[in-house]
Interface confidence: low
Amino acid sequence: MRTEAQVPALQPPEPGLEGAMGHRTLVLPWVLLTLCVTAGTPEVWVQVRMEATELSSFTIRCGFLGSGSISLVTVSWGGPNGAGGTTLAVLHPERGIRQWAPARQARWETQSSISLILEGSGASSPCANTTFCCKFASFPEGSWEACGSLPPSSDPGLSAPPTPAPILRADLAGILGVSGVLLFGCVYLLHLLRRHKHRPAPRLQPSRTSPQAPRARAWAPSQASQAALHVPYATINTSCRPATLDTAHPHGGPSWWASLPTHAAHRPQGPAAWASTPIPARGSFVSVENGLYAQAGERPPHTGPGLTLFPDPRGPRAMEGPLGVR
């Protein structure tokens, strides 16, 4: 189960101002416009799963929804990497994977998504309110990070569906499908705008009831509104920080997912600026960042999502790289 793309709440226009354009016709261009504006913006999604059979066992899955090619993925907990977070795993498409306790198994699921199994007991056990963050470095988009945690009051044993819900995939078919829909939407929007350009435009009341941070693809705030979201990073209970873990055992059984598709708007004006927002009725935590590279230098073109597929998604030289964890 995952939160669906949400559109900011639109207040109905004031009586008498709706004119010939019906409410439905008004909302549709607005939605399409935001879709068109954000169509090219990458997104990172994070899913955190707790095994019902072993409450100290977590699986984190992260994916990158963008057309660029991924040059590095970093998974951390306790906050963003570099902002108090502790690195759990680093996945490099060529040089392989390295991980640190209590991470048990990090792997590439596709060329644009990874999974990490975390296991511990006692001091090394992750807490239910632990924040996990995934950072994707990609060319040419830059650095994108999203964080997620488990809802605090859920019972994995009771609420567990037998299988995880469908997961967003940034493979070629998905990209082409979404691109097609967005292209059609943009064309339709232009058609609507031309059709209604001579009609009186209704005035929209700004919504004061949903000051949410950007976490859905359908809403890309401007840089100005984004700047207003910069808040100190309120993190987790630090008593759940990692210790060392000597043993790890695989666990099966049903599981439940807290999936957080997050949207990150470009903020080239400064270093890691964090926006965090609780998701209503889910108790999860989302943070997004785009840190553009210091020198704005080129990032190397290489095999990315939907291009050449290798048997090992890490690429042709994955096993000759120095850092493969075997």
Epitope: T87, E94, R98, W100, G297, P300
Partner: antibody, heavy 118, light 107 residues
């Protein structure tokens, strides 16, 4: 302060052995990859051996089978055991750290000199 | 093995000059390339990592660019303390390999 200090260099005869040590401080040694790099007088830099945080070791063809890199995380120490030494192994040997990310050696020791001569 | 070809092997320049050093990889290395400065009797010091990112504490007159197989180190305005030997290092795959070095001398 992040610091690497090499020791163990000296004069050795061809065919002999030598063990270099590198003492690390100021960072979590067990997390990072470590390397040995050498430089003959007036020459360029040559990577000699690497060991990742899982203990996996890597060598170029020029020293494979003769040199052995190892680490002792409890002592924050890196070692290079050099056997069957040749005159061409004469150089300054540097210990270098490669952090979690980005790749590449970001911290270097000051080096220890190894001279292979009869 | 990935060969790193660095050019020129040496150059003479004056203070204030703009200096460019190039490194070519024999195969694509993404952006897994660093630039190092070494002065006589000293250990190398990293200036640039990931092809284009400036190492903390390094002057902004140093910049790096490139990706795949072609990389460039640029010193925008050469200073007296910049006369040294510069090396590139590919860290994409083992064996790690350095360029042959570029000695920057005073004209």
């Amino acid at each position: 302060e992040v610091q690497l200090v090499e020791s163990g260099g000296g004069l050795v005869q061809p065919g002999g052995s030598l063990r270099l040590s590198c003492a690390a401080s100021g960072f979590t040694f067990s997390r990072d990859d470590m390397h040995w790099v050498r430089q003959a007088t007036g020459k360029g830099l040559e990577w000699v051996a690497g060991i990742d945080n899982a203990g996996e070791t890597y060598y170029p063809g020029s020293v494979k089978g003769r040199f052995t890199i190892s680490r002792e995380n409890a002592k924050n120490s890196l070692y290079l055991q050099m056997n069957s030494l040749r005159a061409g192994d004469t150089a300054i040997y540097y210990c270098a750290r490669e952090g979690q990310w980005p790749y590449g050696m970001d911290v270097w020791g000051q080096g220890t000199t190894v001279t292979v001569s009869s | 093995d990935i060969q790193m070809t660095q050019s020129p092997s040496s150059l003479s320049a004056s203070v204030g000059d703009r200096v460019t050093i190039t490194c070519r990889a024999s195969q694509g290395i993404r952006n897994d390339l660093g630039w190092y400065q070494q002065k006589p009797g000293k250990a190398p010091k990293r200036l640039i990592y990931s092809a284009s990112s400036l190492q903390s504490g390094v002057s902004s007159r140093f910049s790096g660019s490139g990706s795949g197989t072609e990389f460039t180190l640029t010193i925008s305005s050469l200073q007296p303390e910049d006369f040294a030997t510069y090396y590139c290092l590919q860290s994409n795959s083992y064996p790690l390999t350095f360029g042959g070095g570029t000695k920057v001398e005073i004209k």
